[in-house]
Interface confidence: medium
């Protein structure tokens, strides 16, 4: 847009630079992107809220990311479209600065959330024994809060108070942009902190995740399951827990309810959680079996993730408590990333022949785990997780790089950037918020099913969708 002024009064020619059909096209495209961003991120947030199986530490990070992306979809995209289409900023300097502060703080919070997720995955892969213990809801909350606070500190004061720092507001009436972008040092500093440093960190983390996954795949290829030692009774930790209804396995973290079929424990579907890598990144390394004997119906049995369960029939005694023998990976409640130690839990029964039943069940399961699997399926989950993290990283770089390169160019050669190129670059950053829900959520089967239920208004049993 070329805002020429006449020499007498410097009044601005505030008119739309676009023809009517161009305005319609821009509004349709921008409106559609805004709508998709809003719907996508609301779906992520509502899914996590309504489905208890999605209420995991990993998904708290996604919830925070969705919050940031939703704000971008609601406010940033639409206000920028208005500004672009009508050719000037109609809402005054105060709203301008508030919009810019919100825009940059939230966009940066989105980036910081991506960074947190990368760190989380990195620690899951590189510290599988120590990190899950620390990976609590409280810690996740602190990390999320840090992301938002850091983003606020980085952008809000500079945007809101720069005019007072330098003593003059140099932004024209009818325009809205960051005043300090004329200051090379500040521009370079914020660009490095908000984009270049996160990109470098995320790239390094991805490289480490990729390397760890590749080494694990190689290790798996070298050691076929047929040659692995079967689980022997002496290796299994037996723990008798006195009768108690509270000793039922928790369902909060359950991901896929797999039954033992024909005496074989089926593998988790490889497609499950391909992006999240949710706690299943290394589930190829172990198979976990949970046998539950109780007076519950088969479909009432709940289980921890990574477990395979079978009902051993109803107890004859009406008053008998459940007997639960659980062999497999014992992992912290807070949706840990990788298995830690193998346990057998025998949850006792107060009914007749309780001990006898426990012994039979224990023997049967130990016997079953002794049978070596004929062939291990290709470890494609690690590859998939690594591939998806790469996709997320590339999506972030592709959508954010053009704008951040232009910002630097602008400090020493503003006319070098055509208006349309700048606008597209600015919009690309917003599009990252449209892509994020698809990148993270749509590759998770539980998310997908919950989305489907929400969109089709099937609210019955939505809280237990796996």
């Amino acid at each position: 847009m070329n805002n020429s002024t006449n020499s007498s009064n410097n009044s601005l020619a505030l008119t739309s630079p676009y023809k009517t059909f161009e305005v319609v096209f821009i509004v349709l495209v921008a409106g559609s992107l805004s709508l998709v961003t809003i719907i996508g991120n609301i779906l992520v947030m509502v899914s996590i809220k309504v489905n208890r199986h999605l209420q995991t530490v990993n998904n708290y990070f996604l919830f925070s990311l969705a919050c940031a992306d939703l704000i971008i979809g609601v406010f940033s995209m639409n206000l920028y479209t208005l500004y672009t289409v009508i050719g000037y900023w109609p809402l005054g300097p105060v709203v301008c600065d508030l919009w810019l502060a919100l825009d940059y703080v939230v966009s940066n919070a989105s980036v910081m959330n991506l960074l947190i997720i990368s760190f989380d995955r990195y620690f899951c892969v590189t510290k599988p024994l120590t990190y899950p213990v620390k990976r609590t809801t409280k810690m996740a909350g602190m990390m999320i809060a840090a992301a938002w606070v850091l983003s606020f500190i980085l952008w809000a004061p500079a945007i809101l108070f720069w005019q007072f720092i330098v003593g003059v507001r140099t932004v024209e009436d009818g325009e809205c942009y960051i005043q300090f972008f004329s200051n090379a040092a500040v521009t370079f500093g914020t660009a490095i902190a908000a984009f270049y440093l996160p990109v470098i960190i995320m790239t390094v983390l991805y490289w480490h995740i990729s390397r760890a996954s590749k080494s694990r795949i190689k290790k798996d290829k070298k050691e076929p399951v047929a040659n692995q030692d079967p689980v022997s009774p002496s290796l299994v930790q037996g723990r008798i827990v006195k009768p108690n209804n509270n000793n039922m396995p928790s369902s909060d973290d359950g991901l896929e309810h797999n039954k033992i079929q024909n005496g074989k424990a089926p593998r988790d579907p490889v497609t499950e959680n391909c992006v999240q890598g949710e706690e299943k990144e290394s589930s190829n390394d172990s198979t976990s079996v949970s046998a539950v004997a109780s007076n519950m119906r088969d479909d009432e049995i709940t289980q921890d993730e990574n477990t395979v369960s079978t009902s051993l029939g109803h107890s004859k005694d009406e008053n008998s408590k459940q007997t639960c023998i659980r062999i497999g990976t014992k992992t912290p409640k807070s949706d840990s990333c990788t298995p830690t130690n193998t346990t057998v839990e025998v949850v006792g029964s107060s009914g007749q022949n309780g001990d006898e039943k426990q012994n039979i069940v224990a023997r049967k399961i130990v016997k079953m785990t002794k049978q070596p699997a004929k062939k291990k399926p290709p470890p494609s989950r690690e590859k998939k997780v690594t591939r998806t993290i790469l996709a997320i990283l590339l999506a972030f770089i592709i959508t954010w790089a053009p704008y951040n390169v232009m910002v630097l160019i602008n400090t020493f050669c503003a006319p070098c950037i055509p208006n349309t190129v700048w606008t597209i670059g600015y919009w690309l950053c917003y599009i990252n918020s449209t892509i994020n829900p698809a990148c993270y959520a749509l590759c998770n089967a539980t998310f997908k099913k919950t989305f489907k239920h929400l969109l089709m208004c099937h609210y019955k049993n939505i809280g237990a969708t796996r």
């Epitope: 847009m1 070329n2 805002n3 020429s4 002024t5 410097n10 601005l12 630079p17 672009t84 330098v166 003059v168 507001r169 140099t170 024209e172 325009e175 942009y177 972008f181 004329s182 200051n183 090379a184 232009m406 910002v407 602008n410 020493f412 050669c413 503003a414 006319p415 950037i417 208006n419 700048w422 606008t423 600015y426």
Partner: nanobody
Framework: QVQLQESGGGLVQPGGSLRLSCTAS?????????TTWYRQAPGKQRELVAV????????NYADSVKGRFTISRDDAKNTVYLQMNNLKPEDTAVYYC??????????????WGQGTQVTVSS
């Protein structure tokens, strides 16, 4: 808005010197402005005389004034200067100060002063 005020014009003999000043008020001429001196002789089109550009204070001059005129800028005083040496009668014109501000994704804003008369005559 930015108001530009020229000063320093007047009557001078051929071979003489003048220093024109262009002071910005309202908002500062920061490093995002390109500042230019134009001139317009009676009955002629406005022509570019000298530009003080964006990157690192680059300067450009019309062929007719090269070696005689010098453009400079003092950010502390929000002022752009045009030092005119070895003036010729054909330099007689009204001299205008112009500031161009590029706004990323928006384009340029042109700010003009009212002009100052320079007359070179013996």
């Amino acid at each position: 808005q930015v108001q530009l005020q020229e000063s320093g014009g007047g009557l001078v003999q051929p071979g003489g010197s003048l220093r024109l000043s262009c002071t910005a008020s309202g908002r500062s001429i920061s490093n995002i402005y390109a500042t230019t001196w134009y001139r317009q002789a009676p009955g002629k089109q406005r022509e570019l005389v000298a530009v003080f550009g964006y990157s690192g204070g680059t300067t450009n001059y019309a062929d007719s004034v090269k070696g005689r005129f010098t453009i400079s800028r003092d950010d502390a005083k929000n002022t752009v200067y045009l030092q005119m040496n070895n003036l010729k009668p054909e330099d007689t014109a009204v001299y205008y100060c112009n500031a161009v501000k590029y706004i990323p994704g928006r384009g340029e804003y042109d700010y003009w002063g009212q002009g100052t008369q320079v007359t070179v005559s013996s």
